[in-house]
Amino acid sequence: DTEIKVNPPQDFEIVDPGYLGYLYLQWQPPLSLDHFKECTVEYELKYRNIGSETWKTIITKNLHYKDGFDLNKGIEAKIHTLLPWQCTNGSEVQSSWAETTYWISPQGIPETKVQDMDCVYYNWQYLLCSWKPGIGVLLDTNYNLFYWYEGLDHALQCVDYIKADGQNIGCRFPYLEASDYKDFYICVNGSSENKPIRSSYFTFQLQNIVKPLPPVYLTFTRESSCEIKLKWSIPLGPIPARCFDYEIEIREDDTTLVTATVENETYTLKTTNETRQLCFVVRSKVNIYCSDDGIWSEWSDKQCWEGEDLSKKTLLR
């Protein structure tokens, strides 16, 4: 009763198509699969960035897999062949592991890469990224930004740089068609006559860095003798009402400060007959139904009411 053995996949490699972190892992079937022609061979693939404590694990019948990685760090991957128990009249058989690594050999000391990279997707319409030059780099150093997301044929360079003292310190992106809810990859590299400059890689999803416009058309309505309804409208733009959370700051008679977070465009406030003045401001943020994260908008213009008759909606700026 000979022990059934199977070889690991051949030609296992990590291929970089130039998409700034979106890599292809590919391999060929193992040698000597003739004995298992009736069998569907599977592969167990494990991969991670160097330094990560956990492996991502995939079981597939394909000869390739694609995923995003942090190119600031190395990548390691391993794969073995799996013969299901149906093929072996018993338990599952596994080959030894085939292993490979990938790393973009760096140029330059880490301090030379851009510092404080910050990207904001304004009102879900305009992406703007800004950065500071690396530490100790001279004024002749210039940085260039490249980006890619699924749907682009190849990585594109920024065409509208923000400059300070002749250096690129940011990028205004063009309209980015069908670019949300997928990984958006950025590389900022640099050049200098004086010293090599370290490249820096970033990955995020655009819907998670949205900064909306502030709410507009703030109004008051007297609901009853002791209730006032505060209302506002969503800002102009592509973000639907269902995607907003709001934070309200209410000041009564310059003393009491109430803050509240709500999910729709109204808030009912309990007041006393003694209330002489009421002011409120609102700001908005994309909520958990539409993104995993977001940035609060600026506060709206302040709206105030002074006097007795709220029903007339006397609004004072």
Epitope: W103, P106, Q107, I109, P110, E111, K195
Partner: antibody, heavy 116, light 108 residues
């Protein structure tokens, strides 16, 4: 397997220069940077400079005026030259491979004595 | 430049004892760029722990590393004879790259 082998003189006279060759095997110089580090009883481990896979260099500012690092990718050799040596340059000089921003393999070291 | 101060300079430990040594940086270092090397007399340094907490190939699991910012440490959960050596911390964050003066670990 990965190896870095150093060759160079053991004794140099003051004001003369030091030349060390680091011959590598098991990897390509087009894919990895090579650093130079020295070790002396008085100053411990000191980083001197690096030649990156693309051929550009970075030097410790304290040595930039008298240090030169170059390489020949086809011969898998890295060349280290330091001028104007003094007694306090007496040390063991190492080449080391850069991987994942650390020095994962080191040469065996070249022991230098600067003395007349 | 970033100065790395290691303490203690010399320490001794018995077999099976837990050992901890520290490395303090004069300014903040990214944990990705803080490494530890082991060196024995007459040999070149060996990469021991990289990026604060990752063990280099062949390093026993009794070793661990931790820390962030300006404070880092290397720990041996149970001292063995072969662990007697000098351990250096190293920052790869800023030029010039620098090393600590080392902690010499002796077997008691």
């Amino acid at each position: 397997q990965v190896q870095l082998k150093q060759s160079g003189p053991g004794l140099v006279q003051p004001s003369q220069s030091l030349s060390i060759t680091c011959t590598v095997s098991g990897f390509s110089l087009t894919s990895y940077g090579v650093h130079w580090v020295r070790q002396s009883p008085g100053k411990g481990l000191e980083w001197l400079g690096v030649i990156w896979s693309g051929g550009s260099t970075d030097y410790n500012a304290a040595f930039i005026s008298r240090l030169s690092i170059s390489k020949d990718n086809s011969k898998s050799q890295v060349f280290f030259k330091m001028n104007s040596l003094q007694a306090n340059d007496t040390a063991i000089y190492y080449c080391a491979r850069d991987r994942y921003d650390a020095f994962d393999y080191w040469g065996q070291g070249t022991t230098l004595t600067v003395s007349s | 430049q970033i100065v790395l101060t290691q303490s203690p300079a010399i320490m001794s430990a018995s077999l099976g004892e837990r050992v901890t040594m520290t490395c303090t940086a004069s300014s903040s270092v990214s944990s990705s760029y803080l490494h530890w090397y082991q060196q024995k007399p007459g040999s070149s340094p060996k990469l021991w722990i990289y990026s604060t907490s990752n063990l280099a190939s062949g390093v026993p699991a009794r070793f661990s590393g931790s820390g962030s910012g300006t404070s880092y440490s290397l720990t041996i959960s149970s001292m063995e004879a072969e662990d007697a050596a000098t351990y250096y911390c190293h920052q790869y964050h800023r030029s010039p790259l620098t090393f600590g003066a080392g902690t010499k670990l002796e077997l008691k």
